[in-house]
C-alpha cells in the first residue's frame, strides 16, 4: 500500500472519531473546545473539507496518472515479455540446435579421434610388419647370395622360437617322407629337448597325431640330429613305447609321434601323420641391420 493511501485511511479514521464526539452528551468544555465552537467550527470543517477535496483531487489525479503509467508499463512489460519470450524461444531453439550441433560435432570428433587412433594403430602394425618383412627379406637375400649353409633368419612361413625355426605341416606323410621333406628344406624333424619346447610345439599342433624326429628303425631310439636320447628330455605316454605288433600292418612300431594330449607314442612309420620341421639359426649370427 502506498503512503498516500495510508494517509487517506488515517483521515477517514479521524472523521469517524469526530462524529462520535458530536453525538455524545455534552462534556465539560475545555479551552480548546471553546475556541472551536460555533461558526469557527463550520469554517474549520469547510476548510478541512476543501483541503480534503484538494487532497482527494490531487490524489485522484496522481492515481489516474499512475494508472496510466501502470497501464503503459503493463503494456510495455507485456510487449517486453512477449518479445523476450519470443527471443527466449528463439534462443532456446537456437540453443537446442547449437546443442545438437555440438553433440554432433562432439560425436564426429570422437569418431574421427577413434578412426585416427585405429589408423595410427594399423599404421604402426603395418610399419612393424614392413620392418619385419624388410628384415626377413634382406635376410633371405643374404641367404640366397651366400652358400646356404648358415641361416640368420627363419624362412617365410616358419615360426621363430628360441633361436630355432619351426614349420608345421597341414597334410600327412609317412615318417620317412616327412623326414625327407624337412631335409629338402635344410631342416630336420623336430627334436624336443625341453618341457618348454614341448609346450611350444604342442600349442602349435593342437590335438593331432604329429611325427617328430625320433625313431628306433635301426635298433636303439635315436634323435635325427644326433641329440642323445638316453640323457635327454622324454614325454612318453604311460606304457609307451611298446613296439606293438598287433596292428596287423607287419613289423612293430619304430617312429615316435605327438598324440592328441601332446605326450609321445610309438607307431607304424608308414602312417600318414602331420609333421614338424625344425632348423637352428646360426649361433653367431645377428639380425642384419636395416639400411
Amino acid at each position: 500500500m502506498t503512503k498516500e493511501y495510508q494517509d487517506l485511511q488515517h483521515l477517514d479514521n479521524e472523521e469517524s472519531d469526530h462524529h462520535q464526539l458530536r453525538k455524545g452528551p455534552p462534556p465539560p468544555q475545555p479551552l480548546l473546545q471553546r475556541l472551536c465552537s460555533g461558526p469557527r467550527l463550520l469554517l474549520l470543517s469547510l476548510g478541512l473539507s476543501l483541503l480534503l477535496l484538494v487532497v482527494v483531487c490531487v490524489i485522484g489525479s496522481q492515481n489516474s496518472q499512475l494508472q496510466e503509467e501502470l497501464r503503459g508499463l503493463r503494456e510495455t512489460f507485456s510487449n517486453f515479455t512477449a518479445s523476450t519470450e519470443a527471443q527466449v524461444k528463439g534462443l532456446s531453439t537456437q540453443g537446442g540446435n547449437v546443442g545438437r550441433k555440438m553433440k554432433s560435432l562432439e560425436s564426429q570428433l570422437e569418431k574421427q579421434q577413434k578412426d585416427l587412433s585405429e589408423d595410427h594403430s594399423s599404421l604402426l602394425l603395418h610399419v612393424k610388419q614392413f620392418v619385419s618383412d624388410l628384415r626377413s627379406l634382406s635376410c633371405q637375400m643374404a641367404a640366397l647370395q651366400g652358400n646356404g649353409s648358415e641361416r640368420t633368419c627363419c624362412p617365410v612361413n616358419w615360426v621363430e622360437h628360441e633361436r630355432s625355426c619351426y614349420w608345421f605341416s597341414r597334410s600327412g606323410k609317412a615318417w620317412a617322407d616327412a623326414d625327407n621333406y624337412c631335409r629338402l628344406e635344410d631342416a630336420h624333424l623336430v627334436v624336443v629337448t625341453s618341457w618348454e619346447e614341448q609346450k611350444f610345439v604342442q600349442h602349435h599342433i593342437g590335438p593331432v597325431n604329429t611325427w617328430m624326429g625320433l625313431h628306433d628303425q635301426n635298433g636303439p631310439w635315436k634323435w635325427v640330429d644326433g641329440t642323445d636320447y638316453e640323457t635327454g628330455f622324454k614325454n612318453w605316454r604311460p606304457e609307451q613305447p611298446d613296439d606293438w605288433y598287433g596292428h596287423g600292418l607287419g613289423g612293430g612300431e619304430d617312429c615316435a609321434h605327438f598324440t592328441d594330449d601332446g605326450r609321445w607314442n610309438d607307431d607304424v612309420c608308414q602312417r600318414p601323420y602331420r609333421w614338424v620341421c625344425e632348423t637352428e639359426l646360426d649361433k653367431a649370427s645377428q639380425e642384419p641391420p636395416l639400411l
Epitope: A174, D177, D186
Partner: antibody
Framework: QVQLVQSGAEVKKPGASVRVSCKAS????????IHWVRQAPGQGLEWMGW????????NSAQRFQGRVTMTRDTSINTAYMELNRLRSDDTAVYYC???????????????WGQGTLVTVSS | DIQMTQSPSSLSASVGDRVAITCRAS??????LAWFQQKPGKAPKSLIY???SLQSGVPSKFSGSGSGTDFTLTISSLQPEDFATYYC?????????FGGGTKVEIK
C-alpha cells in the same frame, strides 16, 4: 647347354670304397638338386639319394644309409657319391641326374650324366 | 615305399603303330609321375613329367595321361628310333621309385 659329365669306370674289390664324380655345366649348379641312380646289369633303375648343392644337405634311400656319402664342391660345380663297404651286388652303372629347383619338384629329373660303371669283383 | 608296376613288361610293334604303356602306383601319387626312355648302353632320357607335361625337345608323338594311381604313356606313331625300354617313376614320396620297365621291340 646343360651337361652332366661323370668320371670313368672303376673296378673295386669287395669291402673297398668307390667315389664317382659328376661335373655340371650350362646352368647354375647351386640352384638344382643332384640325384644318384644306379642300374645293375640287365636290371631296372634304383634311386640312391639326393644332395642339395647350395647347402650340402643330403638324404638317401634307407637301404643305402650308413654306406653312401654325397658331397659337392661348388667351386668346381661337381657333385660326388661315395659308396663304402662294397659288395659284388653293388656292381652297376651309377648315374647322376639333375632334379628340380624346389621342394615341389625335387624328384623330377630332366638331365642325366652318361653313367659310370663300377665293377665289384674279387 | 610306393611300388610302381608297369605293363606289359615287353611288347612287339611295327613302325607306324600306336603304342600304349601303362604304369600303376600302389597308392595315390596325384600327377607326380615321369616317363623315361633308355636305349642299350645309354643313359635314360626324360620324356614326360607331371604325368602329362612334355620335356623340352621331346617330339609331340609322345604323350602322357592319368592321375592318382593309373597312368599311360602313348606313342602315336612308332618310329625306328623309338625302339627302347621305357620306365615310369613316381616323385610324390620318399623314396623315389621306378617301374620295372617296358621293352618295346620291333615286330
Amino acid at each position: 647347354q646343360v651337361q652332366l659329365v661323370q668320371s670313368g669306370a672303376e673296378v673295386k674289390k669287395p669291402g673297398a670304397s668307390v667315389r664317382v664324380s659328376c661335373k655340371a655345366s650350362g646352368y647354375t649348379f647351386t640352384g638344382y638338386f643332384i640325384h644318384w641312380v644306379r642300374q645293375a646289369p640287365g636290371q631296372g633303375l634304383e634311386w640312391m639319394g639326393w644332395i642339395k648343392p647350395n647347402s650340402g644337405g643330403t638324404n638317401s634311400a634307407q637301404r643305402f644309409q650308413g654306406r653312401v656319402t654325397m658331397t659337392r664342391d661348388t667351386s668346381i660345380n661337381t657333385a660326388y657319391m661315395e659308396l663304402n663297404r662294397l659288395r659284388s651286388d653293388d656292381t652297376a652303372v651309377y648315374y647322376c641326374a639333375r632334379g628340380g629347383t624346389t621342394v615341389a619338384t625335387w624328384g623330377v629329373f630332366d638331365y642325366w650324366g652318361q653313367g659310370t660303371l663300377v665293377t665289384v669283383s674279387s | 615305399d610306393i611300388q610302381m608296376t608297369q605293363s606289359p613288361s615287353s611288347l612287339s610293334a611295327s613302325v607306324g603303330d600306336r603304342v600304349a604303356i601303362t604304369c600303376r602306383a600302389s597308392q595315390d601319387i596325384g600327377n607326380c609321375l615321369a616317363w623315361f626312355q633308355q636305349k642299350p648302353g645309354k643313359a635314360p632320357k626324360s620324356l614326360i613329367y607331371s604325368a602329362s607335361s612334355l620335356q623340352s625337345g621331346v617330339p609331340s608323338k609322345f604323350s602322357g595321361s592319368g592321375s592318382g594311381t593309373d597312368f599311360t604313356l602313348t606313342i602315336s606313331s612308332l618310329q625306328p628310333e623309338d625302339f627302347a625300354t621305357y620306365y615310369c617313376q613316381q616323385s610324390d614320396s620318399y623314396p623315389l621309385t621306378f617301374g620295372g620297365g617296358t621293352k618295346v621291340e620291333i615286330k
